[in-house]
């Protein structure tokens, strides 16, 4: 058993049929010695008396809010949560496996630049009685500070018969060094509590590996005289690291109709303009990627050919 | 050429060669990103490689103030990786695929380090740790980790030279 936060404790249980469970001793936080009784949740049934209560925790029915009283007055609470371990593996029932970029990916994180700011998100089908707490650091043995905000519900989607909820959190490295080569990864730890179930999820990454620039901005077209060609120009996204002579992007420019199966014109460039062939009912799209490190491409920025 | 004591390197040449290094480092192991190498006890194997750190003057401001600190750091790293790529980690079993770009990568690391430091001038170089894995699978894993680390190192070097070519070239 360990303390998650004040008056909240996590009991780690090997979860299999007829498992013996864990013996837990609860102590009432009071100077009083006599006349103390214990109850669980809303029940008025007295579970025991005395300053300490010993219980055998085997299942969710044994978890919950234990309260010690004296003469009708509440002295203190202890909330017990369960963390299940099945076949040596901690349960991952609360969050959905996003399966990208690999199986058992519960947390996904992205950064728009090298400033040390990043966003992580996760998915669940659970809609109520759900809380998350996020901690992060750079490195684990001698951790350097990363400050994370509160996790918030950022999107709701209908997937087949059930709803899916996306939560996200923003974090910022306290002393970021955008130009340096990272040697220690960022660690992100998410505590998830659903009713009386506790689970924790972790992710470890370098900012450079989660970079995904915003799409290029201000796409403009200029038809070339006596030609089917069009000069398309754009600018670096506002959120990208500066100066651009140092933090350079490379771009992919594509002309395509509405269907992915349609023919296309495609060209790669390090410049912020390119000449392409525009077709009626097609769109010109441009996306960006770090020029020197193959992290994710941005989403496409598009303008119609016409 | 970056001569110890102060003259400027051939920024544009260094830019072109460092960008080539980036391309080669990724083609040497493009799928390395799909492997979570940190799960494999990263600390003792690649913590010894020279990293371009915050105080090394490789940021735009540091380059403007005095690029020599940064260039020396890059030079150390290039020599370090060049030696690693020539060591039995890469030459031993399992043999590299004949079409592996590691040979080109090795040559390009040497080429860029020579651009930065002509013969007769010597910056101190970092000692190569004795990383001699006994098992072929350990060697394979170590190659992945070294190449992964090299990708990050050459990306920073390429940024430095691109910025230098754009803003510091005579």
């Amino acid at each position: 058993i360990w303390e998650l936060k004040k008056d909240v404790y996590v009991v780690e249980l090997d979860w299999y049929p007829d498992a013996p469970g864990e013996m837990v001793v609860l102590t009432c936080d009071t100077p009083e010695e006599d006349g103390i009784t214990w109850t669980l949740d809303q029940s008025s049934e007295v579970l025991g008396s005395g300053k300490t209560l010993t219980i055998q925790v085997k299942e969710f029915g044994d978890a919950g809010q234990y309260t010690c009283h004296k003469g009708g007055e509440v002295l203190s609470h202890s909330l017990l949560l369960l963390h299940k371990k099945e076949d040596g593996i901690w349960s991952t029932d609360i969050l959905k496996d996003q399966k990208e970029p690999k199986n058992k990916t519960f947390l996904r994180c992205e950064a728009k630049n090298y400033s040390g700011r990043f966003t992580c998100w996760w998915l669940t089908t659970i809609s109520t009685d759900l809380t998350f707490s996020v901690k992060s650091s750079r490195g684990s043995s001698d951790p350097q500070g990363v400050t994370c905000g509160a996790a918030t519900l950022s999107a709701e989607r209908v997937r087949g018969d059930n709803k899916e909820y996306e939560y996200s959190v923003e974090c910022q490295e306290d002393s970021a060094c955008p130009a340096a080569e990272e040697s220690l990864p960022i660690e992100v730890m998410v505590d998830a509590v659903h009713k009386l179930k506790y689970e924790n999820y972790t992710s470890s990454f370098f900012i450079r590996d989660i970079i995904k620039p915003d799409p290029p901005k201000n796409l403009q077209l200029k038809p070339l005289k006596n030609s089917r060609q069009v000069e398309v120009s754009w600018e670096y996204p506002d959120t990208w690291s500066t100066p651009h002579s140092y933090f350079s992007l490379t771009f992919c420019v594509q002309v395509q109709g509405k269907s992915k199966r349609e023919k296309k014109d495609r060209v790669f460039t390090d410049k912020t303009s390119a000449t392409v062939i525009c077709r009626k009912n097609a769109s010109i799209s441009v996306r960006a990627q770090d020029r020197y490190y193959s992290s994710s491409w941005s989403e496409w920025a598009s303008v119609p050919c016409s | 050429r970056a001569v110890p004591g102060g003259s400027s390197p051939a920024w544009t040449q260094c830019q072109q060669l460092s960008q080539k290094l980036c391309t080669l480092a990724w083609s040497a192991h493009p799928l390395v990103g799909h492997m979570d190498l940190r799960e494999e006890g990263d600390e003792e194997t690649t913590n010894d490689v020279p990293h371009i750190q915050c105080g090394d003057g490789c940021d735009p401001q540091g380059l403007r103030d005095n690029s020599q600190f940064c260039l020396q750091r890059i030079h150390q790293g290039l020599i370090f990786y060049e030696k690693l790529l020539g060591s039995d980690i890469f030459t031993g079993e399992p043999s590299l695929l004949p079409d592996s770009p590691v040979g080109q990568l090795h040559a390009s690391l040497l080429g860029l380090s020579q651009l930065l430091q002509p013969e007769g001038h010597h910056w101190e170089t970092q000692q190569i740790p004795s990383l001699s894995p006994s098992q072929p699978w350990q060697r394979l894993l170590l190659r992945f980790k070294i190449l992964r680390s090299l990708q990050a190192f050459v990306a920073v070097a390429a940024r430095v030279f691109a910025h230098g070519a754009a803003t510091l070239s005579p």
Epitope: E262, K263, D265, V267, F268, T275 | -
Partner: antibody
Framework: QVQLVQSGAEVKKPGASVKVSCKAS????????LHWVRQAPGRGLEWMGW????????ESAPKFQGRVTMTTDTSTSTAYMELRSLRSDDTAVYYC???????????WGQGTMVTVSS | EIVMTQSPATLSVSPGERATLSCRAS??????LHWYQQKPGQAPRLLIY???QSTSGIPARFSGSGSGTEFTLTISSLQSEDFAVYYC?????????FGGGTKVEIK
Amino acid sequence: QVQLVQSGAEVKKPGASVKVSCKASGYTFTDYYLHWVRQAPGRGLEWMGWIDPENGDTESAPKFQGRVTMTTDTSTSTAYMELRSLRSDDTAVYYCNANKELRYFDVWGQGTMVTVSS
Amino acid sequence: EIVMTQSPATLSVSPGERATLSCRASQSISINLHWYQQKPGQAPRLLIYFASQSTSGIPARFSGSGSGTEFTLTISSLQSEDFAVYYCQQSNSFPLTFGGGTKVEIK
């Protein structure tokens, strides 16, 4: 599968014109760009131009502008390349090729030998 | 127009050996570079597109790398059917241009 079959060899006199055909099969004709590339005997490849069969748009290399006409007949899935004012250095194998991507050449015809000789 | 230069013009290699073919552009073309193989009496066939992407059905012994102005086609272990002429082609800008070719012949 995608296939391009070209017309047979031609012998022409200097100053004449030649029209080479290229019949496509195995795909929807308007879904691919069509290019013409030529190769003089013992020489390298030279791009001449492209046509979009969907709308008839064309673009040709500056070297051939005013001398080459590329057309298509969607009813027969056939592309044509006409080269006028032939000279002896136009002697070459002329290839048509098709691709969904405009700027490189995936599927090639077997080639048509055009000999310009007096 | 962009001029593409291939080297060497002829490469003599023994079967089973590795062949490295170079292609240089007269200006930076990012990764807009494609490789073709042509055997005598046949049309060319696409091997590699956008510098390093392998065309389906092409043996894994063919690989491409490079960006900017310098590109390489590597054939890791030459088979008898690989002796041919290889062309690079830039697609950075029109007119599309080819290199002069590298003939890979049996040593």
